[in-house]
């Protein structure tokens, strides 16, 4: 804590600025005045304070605004973001996207901390929802935030979301996450037409049921092996061969190579033999 | 460098329960995923059982009712309690980490055999 001492005469900052690097703790905590610093917050990050000066600083905006910061300071603060703790965030509302894409870039290339943890829970709970933006911006700076959502948080994900996300943000998401995700990308993407929908939705059909499955193979799509050995077990098993022929089009022949593995492996066993004879391919039930 | 280590694996009796450990270190502090897969001889990896950032957990259909997934936050560990074991329960039993960033790590892995 800084003790409370006068400015020394002709000291006083008229703006926030370079000289002030060479301020000591106290004499920026007499000096600088808490409102100057909070209209001019985007200087500070041009200027090379020590740690210990931003911990002046951000005691006089903690002094400032007891009750949180303001949008227009949050969104300013740079690398004084890292100062914060969580409950200092816990006290703010955050509702520009804007704001959220700068404080995430100050983290950026790192682990995602408690303070960055604690900014999108509050941001995400000031809008609702997790919108179609929101997720956008999540999952091009943390990869992995989509699939370390759990199932009861996912089901609030909206499916015009479901739109923002990639093949490889899914990549991490188990069994149970995919349940969730799949039928709201099969509403998500309901307009599309069969090669359209099927280049979009194959990414999560690890959570599509029998039905789903069954009326793709109706539709020509040539599932690969990779996506085939993703799907549900409970799903693959009632697929007739004819089905799971259709299904995976020219890549039937790869069954083969994986019949020793599930679901392939427990999808043979239910079916009748000469059916499975008819895909030439020697594989026993 | 994140490093994950399984115990508590061994031999044991259909109908009986054994208790899995998952201890992480290397992670300072991420938004955190831990699951549970296991891999018996001649199949793939399958799911077990996840725990998530918001403590809330999820299962496998088939060890729902029969296995628990918990966490103990002060000693960086995840724990797999199998009950009621069937033999089909026989398998390497491995740990997974993730972090919302994208960082992922396995464990080696611990035997699970159950005889009957």
């Known amino acids: 804590e800084v003790e409370k001492t006068a400015c020394p005469s002709g000291k006083k900052a008229r703006e926030i600025d370079e000289s002030l690097i060479f301020y000591k703790k106290w004499e920026l905590e007499a000096c600088v005045d808490a409102a100057l610093l909070a209209t001019q917050m985007d200087r500070v990050n041009a200027i090379p304070f020590t740690y210990e000066q931003l911990d002046v600083l951000k005691h006089k905006l903690d002094e400032l605004y007891p009750q949180g910061y303001p949008e227009s300071v949050i969104q300013h603060l740079g690398y004084l973001f890292l100062k914060m703790s969580p409950e200092d965030i816990r006290k703010w509302n955050v509702t520009s996207l804007e704001t959220l894409k700068a404080l995430l870039e100050v983290n950026k290339g790192h682990e995602m901390s408690p303070q960055v943890a604690t900014l999108i829970d509050r941001f995400v709970k000031g809008r609702g929802q997790l919108d179609k933006d929101t997720l956008d911006t999540l999952t091009a700076f943390y990869p992995g935030y989509l699939c370390s959502l759990s199932p009861e948080e996912l089901s609030s994900v909206p499916p015009s979301s479901i739109w923002a996300v990639r093949p490889q943000d899914l990549d991490t998401c188990d069994p149970r996450q995919l349940d969730v995700l799949y039928p709201k990308a099969r509403l998500a993407f309901q307009n599309m037409n069969g090669s359209e929908y099927f280049v979009k939705i194959q990414s999560f059909l690890g959570g599509a049921p029998t039905e789903d499955l069954k009326a793709l193979s109706q539709q020509n799509v040539s599932m690969d092996l990779a996506t085939f050995m993703k799907l549900r077990t409970d799903a693959v098993l009632p697929l007739t061969v004819a089905e799971v022929q259709k299904l995976l089009g020219p890549h039937v022949e790869g069954l083969k190579a994986e019949e020793r593995h599930r679901p392939v492996r427990d999808w043979i066993l239910r079916q009748r033999q000469d059916d499975l004879d008819t895909l030439g391919l020697g594989l026993q039930g | 460098q994140v490093h994950l280590m399984e115990s508590g694996g061994g031999s044991v009796q259909a109908g009986g329960s054994l208790r899995l450990s998952c201890a992480r270190s290397?992670?300072?502090?991420?938004?955190?995923?831990m699951r549970w897969y296991r891999q018996a001889p001649g199949s793939e990896r399958e799911f077990v059982s996840a725990i998530y950032s918001d403590g809330s957990t999820a299962y496998a259909d088939s060890v729902k009712g029969r296995f628990t997934m918990s966490q103990d936050d002060a000693k960086n560990t995840v724990y797999l309690q199998m009950n009621s074991v069937k033999p089909e329960d026989t398998a390497m039993y491995y740990c997974k980490l993730n972090c919302a960033s994208g960082l992922t790590a396995w464990g080696q892995g611990t035997q699970v055999t159950v005889s009957s």
């Open positions: 290397g992670v300072t502090y991420c938004r955190l995923t």
